[in-house]
């Protein structure tokens, strides 16, 4: 399948936001690309979010998605928000060249996203 590159490790911000780049080596001249973020925990794989975009256009996730992103050539900048400590895990970037044929699919090695819940602020007497 296609080569897909993504960083090995990302640390989410204190606000629960993690960003990483997913880059793929296209064998052909795709006009329609689908990007999916998968979370793998042990032998379970769940879809976090997905977006299809036309080359040269913006990446659009569903309104209720926890993901946003931008695309530039064969590179996709992905942002996942609303993360909590329990969401720490391996996030895999999957890229599919949907149109025109032939169909190509590539799976990244995954980005381990670490999320640390912020410490609650101690009560203050003012």
């Amino acid at each position: 399948a296609m080569h897909v590159a993504q960083p090995a490790v990302v640390l989410a911000s204190s606000r629960g936001i993690a960003s990483f780049v997913c880059e793929y080596a296209s064998p052909g001249k795709a006009t329609e690309v689908r990007v999916t973020v998968l979370r793998q925990a042990d032998s379970q794989v769940t879809e976090v979010c997905a977006a299809t975009y036309m080359m040269g256009n913006e990446l659009t996730f569903l309104d209720d998605s926890i993901c946003t992103g931008t695309s530039s050539g064969n590179q996709v900048n992905l942002t996942i928000q609303g993360l909590r400590a329990m969401d720490t895990g391996l996030y895999i970037c999957k890229v599919e060249l949907m149109y025109p044929p032939p169909y190509y699919l590539g799976i990244g090695n995954g980005t381990q996203i670490y999320v640390i819940d912020p410490e609650p602020c101690p009560d203050s007497d003012f």
Epitope: A1, M2, H3, A25, S26, P27, G28, K29, L38, Q40, S43, V45, I92, K94, E96, P101, P102, Y103, Y104, L105, G106, I107
Partner: antibody
Framework: EVQLVESGGGLVQPGRSLRLSCTAS????????MNWVRQAPGKGLEWVGQ??????????YYSDSVKGRFTISRDDSKSIVYLQMNSLKTEDTAVYYC??????WGQGTTVTVSS | DIQMTQSPSSLSASVGDRVTITCGAS??????LNWYQQKPGKSPKLLIY???NLADGMPSRFSGSGSGRDYTLTISSLQPEDVATYYC??????????FGGGTKVEIK
Amino acid sequence: EVQLVESGGGLVQPGRSLRLSCTASGFTFSDNWMNWVRQAPGKGLEWVGQIRNKPYNYETYYSDSVKGRFTISRDDSKSIVYLQMNSLKTEDTAVYYCTGGMDYWGQGTTVTVSS
Amino acid sequence: DIQMTQSPSSLSASVGDRVTITCGASEIIYGALNWYQQKPGKSPKLLIYGATNLADGMPSRFSGSGSGRDYTLTISSLQPEDVATYYCQKILSPPPWTFGGGTKVEIK
């Protein structure tokens, strides 16, 4: 119209060589990873090997059953992919299909290895 | 190498029946799976790509589903022209791009 036409099949003795060709038309050949798939009589499909395209440095991959004996090459200027089969065995007897990506399939060419 | 196990190896159903064929991978393959239809005496044709996407020209009664290691091909209402052998194939790198053993579908 997409077309893949295999040729070069026939009857060959064990230990001998044979070269199959697959001529493509109707699609952008250079964008495609080309595969060979075979089907022994009355059996299922077996992936034989793959040659990728220029962006992937024409990397080749083979199934364990043919590794070291079969070689895939391509000529993008002529839209042809080849399967060079050496040291043929009776178990290589099959219909050989070439595929563009895995989207397009040829009609197949029959290879019979027998003494 | 990842192994692909397809079941059943054959089935017989009536016209209009819902038919389900399963394909299991020995490891997670992330939806990197195609289904093919091979009618008697013909070359195989791509039926479903990427586990869920219907190939051009294929009837909408065919659908694919699944994730992780387990995948399913469904024919919602079997038709006489669906008599064929169906194969799954793993398309995840690295090769080999192994096929399942096939499922022969016949009409009762």
